[in-house]
């Protein structure tokens, strides 16, 4: 019952004499394991005996019996793993026919037939080509052989026109229940030159011997393959000559359909044949020619033919790299004169006069100068003649103003406060001068272009420079104005002593000034408006208070004189010329007020006074005025004072005070004798007690 069995294997196995066959086979039976397997050659069923008869090539029973003489047949499967693969090695032509696989299980029986085709000689492989081959389009060439056997090694090799193909082929072998084959695949980009060539696939044995082969002729579709020919042979022609160009189609598959011609990439109208003739060529017909031929694959373009029409140089023109050009810059001159062949010699002209030593198409002036300005023209020459000289090109050379100088217009010498006029001059300029600049910049008047008026010129306006300017400024050398001025910065400086001045000191004063022009100066010293000396230094060997006062120094030159700020010279000295004065006179009546004042001359002023009697006894009093109120006859006597400042002390001479009796006292005395006691026992005129009680500040 076929529904119980499922057996898979190739339908037909191919081989040749002496080779081998490998029959891949798998089975499945519903009731499980296979018990018996018999391989028949061309089995036939005997109806009478209800069994198959024929040559038994292999028999697998429970005891594993194999018919004698059939060692070349191997059952590679087994009855457990559903594998029924078998091989016959070697195989012979008479093995052709049917192989019968008799399979018996516990309950089921089956006969499976496999066709075996063994040829006398190795059969050829089959080359398979794609339906269309087109140049440069990659395809895969396939060589297929319906044979493969593990025991018999073979090789497939590709040849093109009998020579092995360089491309690497990939060989695939299949030994499956579906198919048995050996296949070689080759990736190949056919070129137009392969058209009509023979490709061979050779079958080789293990020793490299050719067993069989298959051949195909390549039909490679390609665009037309062209070459272009020119008659006469030269592509260099002279103006007026005739030229014929022929487009040769060396190969085309399929045949070409259209022809056209192009010059410099542009289609030439009404030129549709393989031959192009140009009659009496002109300069404009110089160019690159090619033919374009098309077929169904596409258009093809020939190589370009460069047709050169020779002619004498055309009227020239000069190209200048920059105009106007700046002086000192680099300028390139180029002679443009179309000619074929290119001119071999050039003649240059500057303002119509030939420039010597310049015979090139281009020349350069590295540092252009004003005299290089003018009209430049040129002539070009080639083998066909000398070209016409064109009108020329103008070169304008621009430069900053030249030889800029400055002139002082007013008479010299210049004095501080004068009005000075300066002019700025130059020799030449391109473009014209349009403004002027001045250094230093000041709030100065420019009454006209290039003229500067400095009013009330300063003492320190030492140098002025001007620039004449167009696109650039050119500076003149600065002009020293040499402004004359009276001495400046006149000051009194005390050299000695550096501290305060004391009477008797040596004193040095210096008259300083910061600048003077002219430099020759004279000095004058003044004290309280009176002239003291004419040296830069004023010296006092021993200064006295009488030298104090307001000092200033003057410095003069031929322009004028300048005074310093006044300085008050102060002389410090100890109190001097002390004297005691009495406002009421030196004779005072008793009972009145006696005021003694200590007059002094001191710098700084006296800060402390002392009073003494004729015995040089210090009186306990330190005021400037000694006041005796009421005064007594006993106060009569001589007094002196002493003054002190921070410099020192000074004292007065003695002054005598006489205190006389009042009329009342005299009257009482006449009435009453004066006793000895009245005079008192002391020699001191004024007692401590008296002073204490009677002196009032």
């Amino acid at each position: 019952d076929s529904s119980k069995w499922n057996i898979e294997h190739p339908g037909t196995i191919y081989a040749w004499e002496g080779a081998c066959v490998w029959v891949p086979c798998t089975y499945r039976v519903l009731d499980g394991a296979l018990e018996t397997f018999i391989l028949f050659h061309n089995p036939e069923y005997n109806q009478n005996m209800s069994k198959f008869e024929g040559t038994r090539l292999y028999e697998s029973t429970k005891d594993g019996k194999v018919p004698s003489g059939q060692k070349r047949v191997q059952f590679l499967g087994n009855k457990i793993n559903n594998n029924c693969t078998l091989s016959i090695h070697p195989v012979h032509v008479n093995d052709s026919g049917q192989l019968g696989l008799r399979m018996v299980s516990k309950t089921e029986k089956w006969m499976e037939r496999i066709h075996l085709n063994v040829s006398e000689r190795p059969f050829p492989p089959r080359i398979q080509l794609p339906p269309k081959l087109q140049e440069s389009q990659e395809v895969t060439l396939t060589c297929l052989l319906n044979f493969s056997c593990y025991g018999y090694q073979i090789q497939l090799q590709w040849l093109l026109e009998g020579a092995p193909m360089r491309q690497a082929a990939v060989t695939l072998t299949s030994l499956s229940t579906k198919s048995v084959f050996t296949r070689s695949e080759l990736k190949f980009s056919p070129q137009w030159s392969h058209h009509g060539k023979i490709v061979t696939c050779e079958l080789h044995d293990v020793d490299g011997k050719v067993l069989s082969e298959d051949m195909v002729q390549l039909n490679v579709k390609h665009t037309p393959k062209l070459t272009i020919e020119v008659t006469p042979n030269e592509t260099i022609v002279r103006k007026g000559d005739s030229v014929t160009m022929t487009c040769k189609v060396n190969s085309s598959n399929p045949e070409y359909t259209t022809v056209s011609w192009l010059k410099d990439g542009i289609l030439l109208k009404e030129q549709n044949t393989l031959m192009l003739t140009l009659h009496k060529v002109t300069k404009s017909q110089s160019g690159r020619y090619c033919c374009r031929v098309s077929n169904d694959v596409g258009p093809a373009t020939s190589e370009k033919v460069f047709l050169q029409v020779q002619y004498a140089p055309e009227p020239s023109r000069v190209q200048i790299s920059q105009s106007p050009a700046v002086e000192g810059s680099e300028v390139n001159f180029l002679c443009i004169s179309p000619a074929n062949p290119l001119p071999t010699n050039y003649t240059w002209y500057h303002n119509g006069k030939e420039v010597q030593g310049r015979t090139e198409k281009q020349f350069q002036i590295q540092k252009i100068l004003p005299w290089h300005a003018g009209t430049y023209s040129c002539e070009a020459e080639n083998i066909l003649g000398i070209g016409e000289r064109g009108p020329g090109t103008e070169l304008d050379v621009q430069y900053p103003p030249k030889k800029v100088t400055m002139v002082i217009e007013n008479p010299t010498p210049i004095r501080e406060g004068d009005t000075v006029t300066l002019s700025c001059n130059y020799s030449s300029s391109n473009p014209i001068v349009n403004h002027y600049e001045w250094r230093p910049r000041g709030a100065w008047e420019e009454p006209s272009l290039g003229v500067l008026k400095i009013q009330n010129i300063g003492w320190n306006n030492t140098a002025v420079a001007c620039a004449a300017c167009n696109n650039w400024c050119s500076w003149a050398s600065p002009v020293t104005l040499n402004v004359l001025y009276a001495p400046r910065g006149v000051r009194v400086r005390k050299i000695k002593p550096l501290s305060e001045i004391h009477s008797g000191n040596s004193v040095s004063l210096q008259c300083d000034f910061s600048s003077s022009h002219p430099k020759e100066v004279q000095f004058f010293w003044e004290k309280n408006g009176s002239l003291l000396g004419k040296e830069s230094q004023l010296n006092f060997d021993s200064i006295s208070p009488e030298d104090a006062g307001s000092y200033s120094c003057w410095v003069n030159n031929s322009i004028g004189q300048t005074a310093s700020k006044a300085w008050t010279l102060e002389v410090l000295y100890a109190p001097r010329r002390l004297r005691v004065s009495m406002s009421q006179g030196n004779q005072v009546m008793e009972g009145k007020t006696a005021t003694l004042t200590c007059e002094s001359d001191a710098n700084p002023p006296v800060y402390s006074y002392a009073w003494f009697d004729w015995n040089n006894q210090s009186l306990p009093y330190s005021g400037r005025m000694l006041r005796l109120e009421p005064v007594k006859v006993q106060h009569s006597g001589a007094y002196w004072c002493q003054g002190t400042n921070r410099v020192g002390k000074g004292h007065s001479p003695l002054i005598t005070l006489t205190v006389y009796y009042s009329p009342q006292t005299i009257g009482r005395r006449e009435q009453k004798l004066i006793s000895e006691e009245d005079l008192g026992g002391e020699q001191k005129l004024i007692s401590e007690e008296d002073l204490h009680h009677h002196h009032h500040h």
């Epitope: 400086r493 005390k494 050299i495 000695k496 550096l498 040095s508 310093s564 700020k565 300085w567 102060e570």
Partner: antibody
Framework: EVQLVQSGAEVKKPGESLKISCKGS????????IAWVRQMPGKGLELMGI????????TYNPSFQGQVTISADKSISNAYLQWSSLKASDTAMYYC??????????????????WGLGTLVTVSS | EIVLTQSPGTLSLSPGERATLSCRAS???????LAWYQQKPGQAPRLLIY???SRATGIPDRFSGSGSGTDFTLTISRLEPEDFAVYYC?????????FGQGTKVEIK
């Protein structure tokens, strides 16, 4: 331009003697006092003394009296500061400066201007 | 001798700020005989002010001095990057002439 140019740096050993100089230019050297000022490393300024090149009158700061000698030679516009026996504590920068000034009103001002760039004296055993 | 005391010892400020430096004398400085100097690292001092308030030649007007007697001030109205330095006051009214110990003005 008024300028004071001082002599170069000195490296000395304790006990050695040294004389550094200060040269004036651009003014009448004889008529201006020259001051010497000490600046010890990382410290402030100390006036050492002053000299009047015109007659070489010198005034010392009491702290420096007897430690140094200040002198001048007006013929070559030079002022000098010298030590007879250096000590490590004399390591300092020494500046000379011109004593400028002017009088007006009742005042007489003085100042140090300009200054020399200084002379570095290093005393080390 | 007159001792001059400067304060503060160090002043940390930013450019553009106002700097006020003080100099106090141990006794009255006669006739405002006081000068101010600037010293930058590795350089000699430079005179800024004399007579307590008179600017020396070439000194920018952002520097000003004031004071009399025993209290004096140097003011920098708007600090420029080049003003960061040490500043010394000095009296020349009494012998020996003396300097303050200095005030360092540094960038904050």
């Amino acid at each position: 331009e008024v300028q004071l140019v001082q002599s170069g740096a000195e490296v000395k050993k304790p006990g050695e003697s040294l004389k550094i100089s200060c040269k004036g230019s651009g003014y009448n050297f004889a008529t201006y006092w020259i001051a010497w000022v000490r600046q010890m490393p990382g410290k402030g300024l100390e006036l050492m003394g002053i000299i009047y090149p015109g007659d070489s009158e010198t005034t010392y700061n009491p702290s420096f009296q007897g430690q140094v000698t200040i002198s001048a030679d007006k013929s070559i516009s030079n002022a000098y500061l010298q030590w007879s026996s250096l000590k490590a504590s004399d390591t300092a920068m020494y500046y000379c400066a011109r004593v400028g000034g002017y009088c007006s009103g009742t005042s007489c001002h003085n100042w140090f201007d300009p200054w020399g760039l200084g002379t570095l004296v290093t005393v080390s055993s | 001798e007159i001792v001059l005391t400067q304060s503060p010892g160090t002043l940390s400020l930013s450019p553009g700020e106002r700097a006020t430096l003080s100099c106090r004398a141990s006794q009255s400085v006669s006739s405002s005989y006081l000068a101010w100097y600037q010293q930058k690292p590795g350089q000699a001092p430079r005179l800024l002010i004399y007579g307590a308030s008179s600017r020396a030649t070439g000194i920018p007007d952002r520097f000003s001095g004031s004071g009399s007697g025993t209290d004096f001030t140097l003011t920098i109205s708007r600090l420029e990057p080049e003003d960061f330095a040490v500043y010394y006051c000095q009296q020349y009214g009494s012998s020996p002439w003396t300097f303050g110990q200095g005030t360092k003005v540094e960038i904050k």
